[in-house]
């Protein structure tokens, strides 16, 4: 009839489909970690370092809806903060549980290890508060279960990190087991009916009058789980639909009404024209960051812009605080077809044509590769693109339907995707072991976080690791310092990494020509995720997708502006 508080936490996480927990052990969380093994269906990933653990938690949450990382007081939690900040910026729900010193040690202000030596036990908690939706420091066993529930709910509903401090002495104390019988209420609170009605009526009126409307799916379409509603919106209205770089994967790119990726001035001309000449823009989950908008180069001709957000709506210049897009979209779906019945569908921009045939000996270049990649991808794949050439190149790839796209366009922490790949691979395995996880990362980025490949091997995870070897930090060379020594890196023997980290069943490949790419990606056995694979892609030093070259110029100009 009673269970420990530690076990309570893990039972609650299991109830919301968090089955893998990331992080590292430290003496203030060891008793807590004991309890994970008491809950069937839960596993402790055990990462190589806390930064990578935070990245892994982020990748897992992008697939499963939320995640959990456990670190230890001070040294552990601070190492995770860059990753947690990225999750905050990009709307990813990560519960950060920190094992902290016992309440008595804190009360006595003991000069414990992992402290700053000044008796202040709240300093790290305060640091995290600025990049958390809410925080809790458990001090009372009686209220602890409710606080845990509140933190889990907030993580999921807001899709932001939440900080939960658990003193070492409390995790072994008992709480009533029957509390687990009442599920945490994870549903959104209904919108204010009057405001919601005004929003819906206004949108329907705009739709009725529109001759040239478009739908634009952005980051929070995926993060706040309105992908299904957005897909239905496209079906019902037949409006042309576009994505932003952060929206890749949020709508079906094989849909006949899909028009491409809109990135302001960096868009293909026909996409730019289609979006910017629209007389109504339904923007779902907009996140208007520089790299997501071609350095803020949106140039809409219309003022009829409807922005759907997780916690507010914006129509033209009017903001409706607290009106959540999920409910608005669900209600719109019941009436919008009627409002849109006068719309005469216009042609959407043509797909990027397939690559022209070239001799098999042609050296591989990015423009060709990203276009060709679509032939290798399958429905349900998780495609992860590192900050740099990969995150820009992937915009040129047309995804199969139901593809998950992961990149960190706003926060842009180099090396993020190695850890995110680990997290996504855990999540994918839990959903369907055949689901493929495919990473594209530069040789420079990989050097920041390479240790997490070891964790993939430890758990028998089987991602595809495509390493783009173009000899250095290409994105930074393009922005500034093309020949600067600080943009150079030590070359690695990439194909020795898997055995170095202890892999037994693995494959390595080096690809330098178009013929080698096609031969490998068309090989039937290569298409099954039967083992972990590292594929080194040899590319010319300054080779980059054209959209990155253009973005680099814009960024350099912004940085130089007085």
């Amino acid at each position: 009839s009673e269970i420990t508080l530690g076990k309570y936490l893990f039972e609650r996480l299991k109830q919301v489909n968090v089955n893998t927990v990331f992080g590292l052990p430290g003496d203030f969380n060891l008793s807590l970690l004991d309890k994970i093994y008491e809950v069937e269906g839960m596993r402790w990933a055990g990462n190589a370092n806390e930064l990578n653990a935070a990245y892994a938690a982020d990748g897992y949450a992008r697939i499963k809806g939320m995640s959990c990382i456990i670190t230890t007081f001070g040294v552990g939690e601070l190492s995770a903060l860059n990753g947690i900040a990225g999750s905050y910026a990009e709307h990813v729900g990560v519960l950060h549980v920190v094992g902290v010193p016992s309440i008595s040690a804190q009360a006595k202000q003991l000069l414990l290890h992992h402290t700053l030596g000044n008796g202040d036990f709240t300093v790290f908690h305060r640091m995290s508060a600025n990049i958390s939706e809410t925080t809790a420091m458990i001090t009372d066993i009686a209220t602890a279960p409710a606080e845990i529930d509140r933190c889990i709910r907030t993580t999921y509903v807001t899709q932001r990190p939440v900080y939960l401090g658990l003193p070492a002495n409390l995790v072994d104390l008992n709480v009533p087991a029957k509390l687990l019988q009442t599920p945490i209420d994870m549903s959104l609170k209904p919108n204010d009916a009057e405001s919601e009605k005004e929003v819906i009526d206004t949108i329907l009126a705009l739709v009725k009058d529109a001759k040239n409307p478009v739908i634009l799916a952005d980051a929070c379409c995926s993060r706040h789980d309105v992908k299904a509603e957005t897909k239905k919106l496209i079906d019902l209205t037949q409006f042309p639909a576009f994505v932003t770089p952060m929206g890749k994967g949020s709508i079906d790119e094989q849909h006949p009404r899909y028009g491409g990726v809109y990135v302001g001035t960096l868009s293909k001309p026909e996409v730019k024209e289609a979006v910017e000449s629209a007389d109504l823009i339904l923007s779902v989950g907009a996140l208007l960051s520089d790299f997501n908008t071609g350095s803020f180069s949106y140039s809409y001709k219309t003022k009829n812009i409807v922005e759907f957000h997780s916690d507010h709506m914006k129509i033209r210049n009017a903001t409706f605080p607290g009106v959540q897009m999920k409910f608005v979209l669900q209600k719109l779906l019941t009436t919008i077809a009627d409002a849109a019945k006068g719309y005469k569908p216009v042609a959407v921009p043509a797909r990027t044509p397939a690559n022209a045939a070239v001799p098999a000996s042609t050296p591989l270049k990015q423009e060709w590769m990203w276009n060709q990649l679509g032939n290798f991808l399958q429905e349900g794949d998780v495609v992860i693109a590192e900050t740099g050439t990969s995150a820009f190149g992937i915009n040129q790839t047309t995804f199969p339907n139901n593809t998950y796209g992961i990149s960190q366009v706003l926060w842009g922490s180099i090396g993020f995707t190695t850890g995110a790949t680990l997290g996504a691979a855990f999540a994918a395995e839990e959903i369907d072991p055949k689901k493929r996880v495919i990473l594209f990362i530069g040789d420079g980025s990989l050097q920041l976080t390479v240790q997490e490949i070891s964790t993939m091997i430890r758990w028998g995870l089987k991602p595809y690791l495509f390493v783009l070897n173009n000899d250095g930090y290409t994105i930074e060379k393009l922005i500034h310092g093309p020949k600067a020594q600080y943009n150079e890196i030590q070359g690695w023997d990439h194909l020795s990494l898997l055995p170095t980290f202890g892999a037994k069943d693995y494959e390595t490949h080096r690809v330098a020509t178009t013929g080698e790419w096609d031969k490998l990606t068309q090989d039937k056995s290569f298409n099954d995720n039967s083992k972990i694979r590292m594929i080194e892609i040899m590319l010319p030093v300054f080779d980059a997708p054209q959209n990155l070259v253009e973005q680099a110029k814009l960024t350099a100009a912004t940085n130089a502006k007085q």
Partner: nanobody, 113 residues
Framework: QVQLVESGGGLVQPGGSLRLSCAAS????????LGWYRQAPGKQRELVAT???????YYVDSAKGRFTVSRDNAKNTVYLQMNSLNSEDTAVYYC???????WGQGTQVTVSS
């Protein structure tokens, strides 16, 4: 591994009723939107109804007033009650876990006299 198993399909006369079930395993689906879809011979798979985390429901026009979608989170099961069936409802009915893109194997519904 997440799995969805549909049941309750069969042969029914026009005007009759059926209740389809979709049981989930490997997941607690109380925090997931579930959709019922159908695919008639020679046609594309189409949405029929969805039920969200909070229990909000959505129906396509052809299902409104005849079909009711509901969920029992304790049993990890979602239901589709279908009344006033007609020959155009003949199809394989699938359920789908929307966030994860996971489909069941389908259950055949045939409406015929």
């Amino acid at each position: 591994q997440v799995q969805l198993v549909e049941s309750g399909g069969g042969l029914v006369q026009p005007g009759g009723s059926l209740r389809l079930s979709c049981a989930a395993s490997g997941i607690s689906f109380s925090i997931n939107t579930l959709g019922w879809y159908r695919q008639a011979p020679g046609k594309q798979r189409e949405l029929v109804a969805t039920v969200t985390t909070g229990g909000s429901t959505y129906y396509v026009d052809s299902a409104k007033g005849r079909f009711t979608v509901s969920r029992d989170n304790a049993k990890n099961t979602v239901y589709l009650q279908m009344n006033s069936l007609n020959s155009e409802d003949t199809a394989v009915y699938y359920c789908k876990l929307e966030r994860y893109g996971v489909w069941g194997q389908g259950t055949q519904v045939t409406v015929s006299s």
